[in-house]
Amino acid sequence: CKRVEQKEECVKLAETEETDKSETMETEDVPTSSRLYWADLKTLLSEKLNSIEFADTIKQLSQNTYTPREAGSQKDESLAYYIENQFHEFKFSKVWRDEHYVKIQVKDSAQNSVIIVDKNGRLVYLVENPGGYVAYSKAATVTGKLVHANFGTKKDFEDLYTPVNGSIVIVRAGKITFAEKVANAESLNAIGVLIYMDQTKFPIVNAELSFFGHAHLGTGDPYTPGFPSFNHTQFPPSRSSGLPNIPVQTISRAAAEKLFGNMEGDCPSDWKTDSTCRMVTSESKNVKLTVSNVLKERRILNIFGVIKGYEEPDRYVVVGAQRDALGAGVAAKSSVGTGLLLKLAQVFSDMISKDGFRPSRSIIFASWTAGDFGAVGATEWLEGYLSSLHLKAFTYINLDKVVLGTSNFKVSASPLLYTLMGKIMQDVKHPVDGKSLYRDSNWISKVEKLSFDNAAYPFLAYSGIPAVSFCFCEDADYPYLGTRLDTYEALTQKVPQLNQMVRTAAEVAGQLIIKLTHDVELNLDYERYNSQLLSFVRDLNQYRADIKEMGLSLQWLYSARGDFFRATSRLTTDFGNAEKTDRFVMKKLNDRVMRVEYHFLSPYVSPKESPFRHVFWGSGSHTLPALLENLKLRKQNNGAFNETLFRNQLALATWTIQGAANALSGDVWDIDNEF
């Protein structure tokens, strides 16, 4: 990582190629002495947003000039250069780009196929040569019985009542990511997966519509797991454990219905799906799936622009959006986020140059690519600059898919951001009904965990950077994502008030940026993790008899939780006692806050083998949910319970929590060592 020399200090910013040498933003004559207050900034932001035509930008980004824009394609690059130029026009402190060489999977010239065969493997008929594909599928041909597993969740497989080993599984799109569906099927020794969109959940008129997705249970380039895919790295060939070892293919609804015509058994009524749905292929029929996808190396570009903070430029909030899209449909998937990114960048540039806004901390605007392959661009950047970002990037705000409807405002975030999000929801009005976005004091219980296919996930689970993703959406999935029907026209049809909805999303993101970069005290509520820890300990407590039987005790875990609680209380007291004008003291206190999320990354697993190290939100046996899952097995099925693993899990979880408590306490002489 290059260092950017400032006048006074050296700020490390993650970049690879400088494209602008301007050191500070050009500002008009504005009185710098008068500090703008939250109320002024809120009003200022709102007024600026009122004058912007978001929908026009989204429409422009969805037109032929920039579509289709598969990662690394010519149109993806040309949009990257357009964004780069815009950032220059906004007179950012610095604009740069980040180049990676990544492996993505594309369809081969040989068509993928789904065929019905008889028991002797003789062709009965071709069901479909699908138009879509699933990136990172295994390229293979498999033949077997076809079994419907609803959405392919773990519970769906448990409820199936029929083994799927040696069978191809057909699942509905939705509920969980393609990668999770495939991993669940593969764990039960299924030999292939077909994914379709049923009409009940995805009310699309065109039954022949194909769609796209990826099957990597992870993020980033799966052939450089845990490390960056720069062209000059000397890492030996590697492969993510999240790659499937079975073929996966998306099929149209029409193809699924042809398959159902050769299947038997009514799908359970509680699935609430199409009446045509059937469960298993007739005994005389099998399905043959051929996937011939190939790997291609592509150069991808992430584009960055920074507004440097006036007091703590080496502390930054990152605001990002996905630029690419698989297939021709781009509107809801990447044009809304990219359009919003550009307009927010313009607004903040304006507020600084014309209105006297002086953010204390820096704001990085990032345009990622290869998002459709599993947040590849964002993850590669994180992998490349993990050490540079540590204790510097303190929040990630994801702008992807922020408007997919109007009915609900949904949030997925680190608990550190719950309090701030709650305040902003109380402040911001819904453009349709005029009521505040804060509808329910119990909203936190409805917060969904960030999923693998969200670019915010690697920030939180891999890098330990608090992250937030939000959307205006319906209860039902937006039906056109990943299809060629994800057009501007379709989006405006689904969301007639598109401009107002995006404007409101901009207000939420804008207020977040202001609160996080302007306030002296960092707006990250570290006390929120107390209830997360309490909830975990409560869950674990149900099994105290089992734990006792193994000769183990929860005493040390209680102690670690107690230490964390006391550390948060002490920090709150320290903030209360601190002189807010004492920058040095405030920075030291804020640094302690910034450590919280990072210290929930398990130090006991390798980022290469288990990149998502976060014990609450990560993935792998080191996580607290995995510990509980393992322990649950002791009651259900002693054979599946791994006691040696559990003993390790409990010890390491305890010490990770203790470590987080210690880090929050501050200096080594402040740590209670009676553990």
């Epitope: 028991k119 009542y161 029929t162 038997e264 058994g265 009514d266 799908c267 359970p268 009524s269 009446s275 469960m279 298993v280 007739s282 005994e283 005389s284």
Partner: antibody
Framework: YVQLVESGGGLVQPGGSLRLSCAAS????????MNWVRQAPGKGLEWVSV????????DYADSVKGRFTVSRDNSKNTLYLQMNSLRAEDMATYYC???????????????WGQGTLVTVSS | EIVLTQSPGTLSLSPGERATLSCRAS???????LAWYQQKPGQAPRLLIY???SRATGIPDRFSGSGSGTDFTLTISRLEPEDFAVYYC??????????FGQGTKVEIK
């Protein structure tokens, strides 16, 4: 313990009606296709009717079509056979039988009830 | 409808002997859709073979099924005393109605 218990048989006059029930236990009833099979005294087996696991599909032997109706109540784990316009040739022991594999409509029957006798006589 | 004809009507054999039962269909039946049952007096039928050759759970390996198209066979390699019963074949491959054969009685010689 997987079990099927038929009930509802008895003496009925020609032209009369009868409703047979089959109570299932020990397995996930809603995942299995169910059949009715009958056997006249001293005669062979005759397939009567089939109903898919969710009750969506039903089929009948030509000899009972239009007179018999098969149904199921998955919440009660019970299979039914409504028999109308009964004839002397319908006199038999009626067995309910479970498909040998979950979900499949066309498969052998691996679990049978003990049967209930239907006597059609004036 | 498909008519299944079983032969012989009665088979008289001694314990330890091999029994070969035939089931002939009036038109072709997919081998996936043929089953064999055993029924003893006063009892419900018991599934022996499904899919023409797959043994049902708990069925001893002396029972085996074979055949395709219109000709199917049930073989009992060594008759045990408990094997003396009536055996039925059933097809469920065509569109319903599904049909049983008239049965073959295996009796002690």
């Amino acid at each position: 313990y997987v079990q099927l218990v038929e009930s509802g048989g008895g003496l009925v006059q020609p032209g009369g009606s009868l409703r047979l029930s089959c109570a299932a236990s020990g397995f996930s009833f809603d995942k299995y296709t169910m059949n009715w099979v009958r056997q006249a005294p001293g005669k062979g087996l005759e397939w009567v009717s089939v109903i898919s696991n969710g009750g969506v599909s039903t089929d009948y032997a030509d000899s009972v079509k239009g007179r018999f109706t098969v149904s199921r109540d998955n919440s009660k784990n019970t299979l039914y056979l409504q028999m109308n316009s009964l004839r002397a040739e319908d006199m038999a022991t009626y067995y309910c039988a479970r498909a040998s594999q979950p979900w499949l409509y066309r498969t052998g029957a691996d679990v049978w009830g003990q049967g209930t006798l239907v006597t059609v006589s004036s | 409808e498909i008519v299944l004809t079983q032969s012989p009507g009665t088979l008289s054999l001694s314990p330890g002997e091999r029994a070969t039962l035939s089931c002939r269909a009036s038109q072709s039946v997919s081998s996936s859709y043929l089953a064999w049952y055993q029924q003893k007096p006063g009892q419900a039928p018991r599934l022996l073979i499904y899919g023409a050759s797959s043994r049902a759970t708990g069925i001893p390996d002396r029972f085996s099924g074979s055949g395709s198209g219109t000709d199917f066979t049930l073989t009992i390699s060594r008759l045990e005393p408990e094997d003396f019963a009536v055996y039925y074949c059933q097809q469920y491959g065509s569109s319903p109605p599904w049909t049983f054969g008239q049965g073959t009685k295996v009796e002690i010689k």
